[in-house]
Interface confidence: low
């Protein structure tokens, strides 16, 4: 069966919507009117991995476009990365491992940890008009908490 | 292939009263839980009420309770909420959905419909 998956927008707590900066980096920033068309939709997609009642492994692709939000070493730090892929291969139900987040739902919040670095999450600064990251502290300066936008297909 | 198409909504008056309908075909209706969720413009998903295979279990959430009753008939594959007193705050896209059965807001559905506009002003 093919992976079932959902479009989406999402916005960290305060209200940054999420946007492309460049070929392969997202940045958080408030949107109003007309701008919102600017922010990335997500194709969700529900994959293989760890799952409980309020854990859900999912992939995070750019819908319509062969790019997913990966996580990877860096100088020997995790790092949040846009990712090409061959579009004829992805989504699949088993996405490699820096692929998949936890979807993680708190007080109807969302937070995104990753499955390939446990307790890094991805992260938004408070300052507008930053890169979204991926971070290694929770209830901190970064914003690791997130509302998810359903979108029609 | 999993169809689920909903009808009913509108403009409406606070106060007022509108019956939403979901036609659902592609699998069978009779064997799952079925349910509303809704988003008002520019907000999250919000989690309406569900309803049982045999129709008997229904649940609602608490900004709706006692305002909205789900029903459906398993004999056409159709899935209603009937909504009452309707408050500008109703006002958003309704969706229903086939439901999978975990308990928390986002996870709670596998396939949706399209989706009925209800606004409700003056």
């Known amino acids: 069966a093919p992976v079932r998956s959902l479009n989406c927008t999402l916005r960290d707590s305060q209200q940054k919507s999420l946007v492309m900066s460049g070929p392969y980096e997202l940045k958080a920033l408030h949107l109003q009117g007309q701008d919102m068309e600017q922010q990335v939709v997500f194709s969700m997609s529900f994959v293989q991995g760890e799952e409980s009642n309020d854990k859900i492994p999912v992939a995070l692709g750019l819908k319509e476009k062969n790019l997913y939000l990966s996580c990877v070493l860096k100088d020997d730090k995790p790092t949040l990365q846009l990712e090409s892929v061959d579009p004829k291969n992805y989504p699949k139900k088993k996405m490699e491992k820096r692929f998949v987040f936890n979807k993680i739902e708190i007080n109807n919040k969302l937070e995104f940890e990753s499955a390939q670095f446990p307790n890094w999450y991805i992260s938004t600064s408070q300052a507008e008009n930053m890169p979204v990251f991926l971070g290694g502290t929770k209830g901190g300066q970064d914003i690791t908490d997130f509302t998810m936008q359903f979108v029609s297909s | 292939e999993v169809q689920l198409l909903e009808s009913g909504g509108g403009l409406v008056q606070p106060g007022g009263s509108l019956r939403l309908s979901c036609a659902a075909s592609?699998?069978?209706?009779?064997?799952?839980?079925m349910m509303w969720v809704r988003q008002a413009p520019g907000k999250g998903l919000e989690w309406v009420s569900r309803?049982?295979?045999?129709?008997?279990?229904?649940y609602y959430a608490d900004s709706v309770k006692g305002r909205f009753t789900i029903s459906r008939d398993n004999s056409k594959n159709t899935l209603y909420l009937q909504m009452n007193s309707l408050r500008a705050e109703d006002t958003a896209v309704y969706y229903c959905?086939?439901?999978?059965?975990?308990?928390?807001?986002?996870?709670?559905?596998?396939?949706w419909g399209q989706g009925t506009l209800v606004t409700v002003s003056s």
């Open positions: 959905a086939k439901y999978t059965g975990r308990i928390f807001t986002h996870h709670l559905f596998d396939y």
């Open positions: 592609g699998f069978t209706f009779a064997e799952y839980t």
């Open positions: 309803i049982g295979q045999d129709g008997k279990n229904t």
